[in-house]
Interface confidence: low
């Protein structure tokens, strides 16, 4: 049956998929609040532009009877069920916001006509790359890969004088949705990251990771993992670590490192944290007051999805163009719009660009400090601290190949029991 779009005659509707399975376990009420806050802003912006139109959102809930795992495991079918619900209602908005799970987005993209845009807070996996009508408002795995390759190759900074070509990747299969797809991309033999590295091994057991920390026969000094400090501590504890080990902790959606009173714990001294540059504080907004940092990013992506739609609607209406055309569906890319927290840039494929920040722990102040930033839009690294107070010898990052630099030694101090 033909689905009509409620998207003309001065009335424009946004279809928001409220899926029980999502990339982050966020109460749907909080996402509704984010969407509603976005709608208020969009209405104000359109009114200021002299456009007297109505913009609303329809929240489409899945039944939650079959697909109720709460994470992304059973999301493929849930997405299709919601599409079926839209089809049965024969009613669709101008744009589809959600889903956030890679599986469901991929499947929904395959099973939908390309006549309307899809905006996702998530869909991190490589399988959602280069989709003509899909926009992703949280950093996808491709962006992470490009940073890592860029950083590995860098050898002309005062604190990094070696190019790296090797890595271990710790991936035990219990990661959060974002981490799962980030590490999946690094693991994939066909990915850019794998192509650019000479050696890469995935560590799947806690013991494998723990053994590498002091293994004199290790093939790389660099270990990539994904999660927060708590995750690392429970894995690494207070174990001794060879002095040329560098752990890259990918923790993009966590702005707690930038809070004033945060002291970096001892176990973080061998760690470089990759996170996103924090935006302006969202704590005063009604939708985010009670959200954790990760969830602020997730809710913010929903809100920014609404603002993006408003931005495109305004442009098309001012130009007298039809909203229900493939041109509109394909337009949500290669642009910058005013997001809730500042300008948001989308690349040629509709993926959000951002400033990634690499942090280190200062041995002097025990604070997290910015080592460098990386602009995903131009694929360029900008050093910030030219004289970092590293734990590593000579305040330089070591070579990635064991045996070419100083080696650690001594006994292991286990967190739990000696």
């Amino acid at each position: 049956s033909q689905v009509s779009q409620n998207c003309h005659n001065g009335s424009y509707e946004i279809s928001v998929l409220m899926m029980g399975n999502s990339a982050f376990a966020e109460p749907l009420k909080n996402l509704e609040d984010a969407v509603n806050e976005g709608l208020e802003i969009v209405r104000g912006r359109l009114q200021n532009a002299g456009l007297n139109v109505t913009v609303n959102a329809t929240f489409m809930y899945s039944d939650g009877l079959i697909h109720n795992s709460g994470d992304c495991r059973s999301s493929t079918c849930e997405g299709l069920d919601l599409l079926r619900k839209i089809s049965n209602a024969q009613r669709m908005g101008c744009v589809l916001i959600g889903p956030s799970c890679t599986y469901s987005t991929f499947q929904m993209y395959l099973d939908t006509e390309l006549s309307y845009p899809m905006i996702s807070a998530g869909s991190f996996g490589l399988s959602c790359d280069y989709k003509e009508t899909l926009t992703r408002l949280m950093s996808p795995a491709r962006k992470l890969m490009y940073f890592l390759v860029n950083f590995w190759k860098t050898n002309d900074l005062p604190f990094k004088t070696y190019s790296w070509s090797t890595s271990y990747v710790y991936k035990n299969g219990t990661e959060t949705e974002d981490c799962f797809w980030y590490l999946n991309a690094l693991e994939a033999s066909v990915s850019y990251f794998s192509h650019e590295l000479g050696f890469k091994v995935v560590l799947r057991q806690d013991k494998e990771f723990q053994d590498i920390l002091m293994d004199h026969n290790r093939k790389s000094n660099v270990i990539i993992m994904c999660g927060g400090p708590e995750f690392l501590y429970k894995l690494k504890g207070d174990r001794a670590v060879a002095e040329d080990i560098v752990i890259i902790l990918v923790d993009l959606f966590n702005d707690q490192y930038f809070e004033d009173n945060v002291t970096a714990p001892d176990y973080m001294k061998n760690v470089l944290v990759l996170t996103l540059s924090p935006g302006n504080s969202l704590l005063n907004s009604s939708f985010s007051r009670n959200l954790s940092p990760t969830k602020r990013d997730f809710a913010l992506a929903y809100l920014n999805g609404i603002l993006l739609f408003g931005h495109m609607l305004k442009i098309f209406l001012e130009n007298g163009e039809n909203i229900t055309t493939p041109k509109f569906a394909h337009a949500f890319r290669n642009l910058t719009f005013e997001g809730y927290d500042g300008p948001v840039t989308l690349d040629d494929w509709g993926d959000v660009d951002s400033t990634m920040v690499l942090l280190y722990t200062s041995v002097d102040t025990k604070k997290y400090k910015v080592l460098l930033t990386y602009d995903t839009h131009v694929n360029k690294t900008y050093p910030v601290d030219m004289s970092p107070t590293f734990t590593w010898k000579n305040s330089k990052l070591p070579n990635d190949i064991t045996g070419r630099g100083p080696q650690g030694g001594g006994g292991s101090e286990n967190l739990y029991f000696q």
């Epitope: 707690q256 970096a264 714990p265």
Partner: antibody
Framework: EVQLVESGGGLVQPGGSLRLSCAAS????????MHWVRQAPGKGLEWIGE????????NVHEKFKDRFTISVDKAKNSAYLQMNSLRAEDTAVYYC???????????????WGQGTLVTVSS | DIQLTQSPSSLSASVGDRVTITCRAS??????????MQWYQQKPGKAPKLLIY???KLASGVPSRFSGSGSGTDFTLTISSLQPEDFATYYC????????FGQGTKLEIK
């Protein structure tokens, strides 16, 4: 309301087994570490072990490793303590508690269940 | 394990008294500028209740007459002016390496 409720205690013979449950409500279960702590009659508190619901990581004190296993059912927001080869000295009130790690790395047991009594006797 | 020794094991005091309980760890529980030491209150037949975390930080909802101090291996819980509801057993706990508790201090009415 944040709440932990233990169940499954009772009288068991030496050498027997028992499975204790801890039902969590009022908070995001997967964001915590869930712990089991016991207290023998008239004695102090003794930590048994912990589990991270979202990842299934467990750490059990060496003293209990061979006999006690900790597990979770995320769908039910519940943690479990499986106790095998029980001895008279395992007679105690068993508490379920949680930790939430702060950015600064503090760990503390901020919420406790009411406890469930396990009596091992013939 | 890190061993914790509380003193005294028991203590008699009156309402309005200032009371101090100490806890000594077998090794330092300091961790990058923080001391991972907690204090709990337990009444008969009830679960323990968190009073102090990170040596000196007052847990939510705990009266300000309770305070904690110390660093490294030596820690103190102080009740500035005893109230009738404060008579209970108090435990220290470290979370520096795994989790261990002191043997407890029973605070009784004189």
């Amino acid at each position: 309301e944040v709440q932990l409720v233990e169940s499954g205690g009772g009288l068991v013979q030496p050498g027997g087994s028992l499975r204790l449950s801890c039902a969590a409500s009022g908070f995001t279960f997967s964001h915590t570490w869930m712990h089991w702590v016991r207290q023998a009659p008239g004695k102090g508190l003794e930590w048994i072990g912990e589990i991270k619901p979202s990842r299934g990581f467990t750490n059990v004190h060496e003293k209990f490793k061979d006999r006690f296993t900790i597990s979770v059912d995320k769908a039910k927001n519940s943690a479990y303590l499986q106790m095998n080869s029980l001895r008279a000295e395992d007679t105690a009130v068993y508490y379920c508690t949680r930790t939430i790690t702060t950015t600064q790395g503090y760990w503390f047991f901020d919420v406790w269940g009411q406890g469930t009594l396990v009596t091992v006797s013939s | 394990d890190i061993q914790l020794t509380q003193s005294p094991s028991s203590l008699s005091a009156s309402v309005g008294d200032r009371v101090t309980i100490t806890c000594r760890a077998s090794e330092s529980v300091n961790w990058y500028g923080s001391s991972l030491m907690q204090w709990y209150q337990q009444k008969p037949g009830k679960a323990p209740k968190l009073l102090i975390y990170a040596a000196s930080k007052l847990a939510s909802g705990v009266p300000s007459r309770f305070s904690g101090s110390g660093s490294g291996t030596d820690f103190t819980l102080t009740i500035s002016s005893l109230q009738p509801e404060d008579f209970a057993t108090y435990y220290c706990q470290q979370t520096r390496k795994a989790y261990t508790f002191g043997q407890g201090t029973k605070l009784e009415i004189k």
